[in-house]
Interface confidence: low
């Protein structure tokens, strides 16, 4: 018995279906086919769980969180024992193993391994200003999304004709911050943060209004 090598890792957007491949060759009839799919969740590597089982000609549910979402892609028994997972959740991310036994065919590699990563687009980021907006001050524009896998990067731009940040600005696309030093009237305007990752983008807007000092009355 020989389980074919998996293509490696699979990525899928949250909520979408995933197909985890597992095929094998065998010299025996599929009368005593035994298949166990296991997952070692990324979120809890110490607690492997059963996903779905095929034993004695019957299919069995694994862990309750997979009930109703998992099945074999084809009619069993078969040498293609790939499974689908519908409505993928973040908690489905992990390393999946198919363990195949088909007596009396013993020996060879009877385990296939596939990684599954459930991707999440960035949630609507939160934009805010830190610091005084008085002319000559330093301000920090902050941008962060609560959700996003892979971790989003953040790009700030000023919504004027150039889409460029003021020359006194420095940007950190990982942290989502822009520091603008010595703000002036020219710093005023609408700023947009674009949070993006492999499967999506999301934006928020911020209105920076630099406050000019009030003229002093001479009397």
């Amino acid at each position: 018995l020989e389980v074919s090598e998996s293509p490696g890792s699979i990525q899928v957007a949250r909520g979408q279906p995933a197909v985890l491949p597992c095929t094998f060759t065998t010299s025996a009839a599929l009368i005593n086919l035994n298949v166990i799919w296991m997952v070692t969740p990324l979120s809890n590597a110490n607690q492997p769980e059963q996903v779905i089982l095929y034993q004695g000609g019957q299919m069995f549910d694994g862990a309750p969180r997979f009930h109703g979402r998992v099945g074999f892609t084809g009619t069993m028994p078969a040498t293609n024992v790939s499974i689908f997972i519908n409505n993928t959740q973040l908690s489905d991310t992990g390393t999946y193993q198919c363990l195949v036994n088909n007596l009396p065919d013993i020996g060879g590699r009877n385990i296939g391994v596939t990684g599954l990563t459930v991707l999440v687009p960035p949630s609507a980021p939160h934009c805010q200003i830190q610091g005084s907006q008085d002319i000559g001050s330093d301000v920090i524009l902050l941008c962060s999304s609560e959700e996003g896998i892979p971790r989003p990067t953040y790009l700030w731009e000023k919504l004027d004709n150039t889409l460029k940040l003021p020359p006194t600005a420095t940007q950190d696309q990982v942290q989502g911050t822009v520091t603008i030093r010595n703000i002036s009237a020219l710093s005023s305007g609408l700023y947009q943060c674009v949070a993006s990752n492999a499967i999506g983008t999301s934006t928020c807007l911020l209105d920076l209004q630099v406050i000019s000092p009030q003229p002093r009355n001479i009397g």
Partner: antibody
């Protein structure tokens, strides 16, 4: 209130059929496996059958396999047990029980326990 | 088929410790649960996964499981603990429950 309420029991002749129902309330029915456990008069508990939360998997004791069918309607929060070819030894109080199934690991099967029970319904098989 | 053996009866004085045993082949390799059933009532889960107590079950109920024997221990036994007690294990996911024959606990 979290509860299970069985119905459908009664007197039936040997070889006859009966359908038991169990109405669940107070919890998310579709998230739980469910089971039937019976108790003959003056005797101990005997597990009869179980069904997964989705209804995709069913399990039976050898003593009822081929005669009893467990099913569920998640839209109605109801569990069923269709009992055919009834025998005198099937006479018992039939309890509906919520089954917790905890997944096994690579080296062990999962295990079951029953954390919520109904009041039971009596099935008498006699001529 | 897998069998669980329990003593038919156990007696204990109020305030003393009662131990009810359940034996089966390599029982320690499986998880045991215990149920209490009072006359005319349905069973109540008192211990699961060998030693875990559901909410609402008094702390005087405890459980252990090793080798071929699982044990339910009731410390400071009270009159209200008088009941039948059943142990239960799974033979695997395909067989949800194997119950012991039950033990009648009498509080003298």
């Amino acid at each position: 209130e979290v509860q299970l309420l069985e119905s459908g029991g009664g007197l039936v002749q040997p070889g006859g059929s009966l359908r038991l129902s169990c109405a669940a309330s107070g919890f998310t029915f579709s998230s739980y496996a469910m089971s039937w456990v019976r108790q003959a008069p003056g005797k101990g508990l005997e597990w009869v059958s179980a069904i997964s939360g989705s209804g995709g998997s069913t399990y039976y004791a050898d003593s009822v396999k081929g005669r009893f069918t467990i099913s569920r309607d998640n839209s109605k929060n109801t569990l069923y047990l269709q009992m055919n070819s009834l025998r005198a030894e099937d006479t018992a109080v039939y309890y509906c029980a919520r089954g917790q199934y905890v997944s096994g690991t690579y080296y062990s099967y999962g295990y079951w326990y029953f954390d919520l029970w109904g009041r039971g319904t009596l099935v008498t098989v006699s001529s | 088929s897998y069998e669980l053996t329990q003593p038919p009866s156990v007696s204990v004085s109020p305030g003393q410790t009662a131990s009810i045993t359940c034996s089966g082949d390599k029982l320690g390799d499986k998880y045991a649960s215990w149920y209490q059933q009072k006359p005319g009532q349905s069973p109540v889960l008192v211990i699961y996964q060998d030693s875990k107590r559901p909410s609402g079950i008094p702390e005087r109920f405890s459980g252990s499981n090793s080798g071929n024997t699982a044990t339910l221990t009731i410390s400071g036994t009270q009159a209200e603990d008088e009941a039948d007690y059943y142990c239960q294990v799974s033979r695997g996911h395909t067989s949800a429950g194997v119950f012991g024959g039950g033990t009648k606990l009498t509080v003298l």
